[in-house]
């Protein structure tokens, strides 16, 4: 059920974790694993979860995966998934995290938490 916007605390914690990942990155993040690029204009939390869940054995993003589960604990309807993924486009996890961070910072500044 659609309902109130997320409180800023949860979004702030997610942004802080993404900042931490980008700042502490030394070797290629998750060994250069590739993930599906997502449509950042709709359902960003569930879309990001669906993309990152396919990366296993990468401790650097485990906390991010968990936090995204917090925002998206129940599945969106099957029909919505087709609109979440950018068709046939894969990018490195590091770039995915950077793009997601930029987008979430923008949402936070604008007060658009949903």
């Amino acid at each position: 059920s659609p309902s109130p916007v997320p409180p800023s605390t949860a979004l702030k914690e997610l942004i802080e974790e993404l900042v931490n990942i980008t700042q502490n990155q030394k070797a290629p993040l998750c060994n250069g694993s590739m993930v599906w690029s997502i449509n950042l204009t709709a359902g960003v939390y569930c879309a990001a979860l669906e993309s990152l869940i396919n990366v296993s054995g990468c401790s650097a993003i485990e906390k991010t995966q968990r936090m995204l589960n917090g925002f998206c604990p129940h599945k969106v309807s099957a029909g919505q998934f087709s609109s979440l993924r950018v068709r046939d486009t894969k990018i490195e996890v590091a770039q995915f995290v950077k793009d997601l961070l930029v987008h979430l910072k923008k949402l936070f500044r604008e007060g658009q938490f949903n």
Epitope: S1, P2, S3, P4, V5, P6, P7, T9, A10, L11, E13, L14, Y45, L49, E50, I53, R66, M67, L68, N69, G70, F71, C72, P73, H74, K75, F81, F113, N114
Partner: antibody, heavy 118, light 111 residues
Framework: EVQLVESGGGLVQPGGSLRLSCAAS????????MSWVRQAPGKGLEWVAS???????YYPDSVKGRFTISRDNAKNSLYLQMNSLRAEDTAVYYC????????????WGQGTLVTVSS | DIQMTQSPSSLSASVGDRVTITCKAS??????????VHWYQQKPGKAPKLLIY???NLESGVPSRFSGSGSGTDFTLTISSLQPEDFATYYC?????????FGGGTKVEIK
């Protein structure tokens, strides 16, 4: 210690209301979705409500419009407001940490008993 | 709603036995290659405890004698060598579709 502790259960008449609370400790409460699951005496488990870290709420049809899940991150607390209670709502109500559809309900409280009877 | 049917509803076994519990979903609970079924253990008067997530992944701290398998509609929880502390009721649960639903439970008793 990582734990969840429920309170607020008791005896209530049909049509009455009750508010359950769940106190979380030992983990970053605000980062997790949370759920309520109930178990009627001698029966199986039934999911009752969930709330995301962003306050999106989810309910099964059996309680929609009667039950309201909410959270207070500042108090590390989860709540379940139950209105228009029926005899079939009699159950032990468990608070659970919900790590999403990929990981399930990873931490449970000890439960609180709600009895709806005249 | 997706119905989760467990069998048997109860069984008697001895310490050291290999125990298998099955769970059948009324429709597929697979999602992009993942099976969204989880298994829980509940002892009398206690809260449930997560054992297996996503059909076959062992939750942290759970003994390796527990394992899960299956996909689509048919799932299995196996205890390779039953221990005294394993006598309990076991539930499967699907999270592929709202409402999340549980199986009716399988009670594992001492023979």
């Amino acid at each position: 210690e990582v734990q969840l502790v429920e309170s607020g259960g008791g005896l209530v008449q049909p049509g009455g209301s009750l508010r359950l609370s769940c106190a979380a400790s030992g983990f970053t409460f605000s980062s997790y979705a949370m759920s309520w699951v109930r178990q009627a005496p001698g029966k199986g488990l039934e999911w009752v409500a969930s709330i995301s870290s962003g306050d999106t709420t989810y309910y099964p049809d059996s309680v929609k419009g009667r039950f309201t899940i909410s959270r207070d991150n500042a108090k590390n607390s989860l709540y379940l407001q139950m209105n228009s209670l029926r005899a079939e709502d009699t159950a032990v109500y468990y608070c659970a940490r919900n790590e999403g559809y990929y990981f399930g309900l990873t931490l449970w409280g000890q439960g609180t008993l709600v009895t709806v009877s005249s | 709603d997706i119905q989760m049917t467990q069998s048997p509803s109860s069984l008697s076994a001895s310490v050291g036995d290999r125990v298998t519990i099955t769970c059948k979903a009324s429709e597929s609970v697979d999602h992009f290659g993942w099976s969204l079924v989880h298994w829980y253990q509940q002892k009398p008067g206690k809260a449930p405890k997560l054992l297996i997530y996503r059909a076959s992944n062992l939750e942290s701290g759970v003994p390796s004698r527990f394992s899960g398998s299956g996909s689509g509609t048919d799932f299995t929880l196996t205890i390779s060598s039953l221990q005294p502390e394993d006598f309990a009721t076991y539930y499967c649960q699907q999270s592929n579709e709202d409402p999340w639903t549980f199986g009716g439970g399988t009670k594992v008793e001492i023979k």
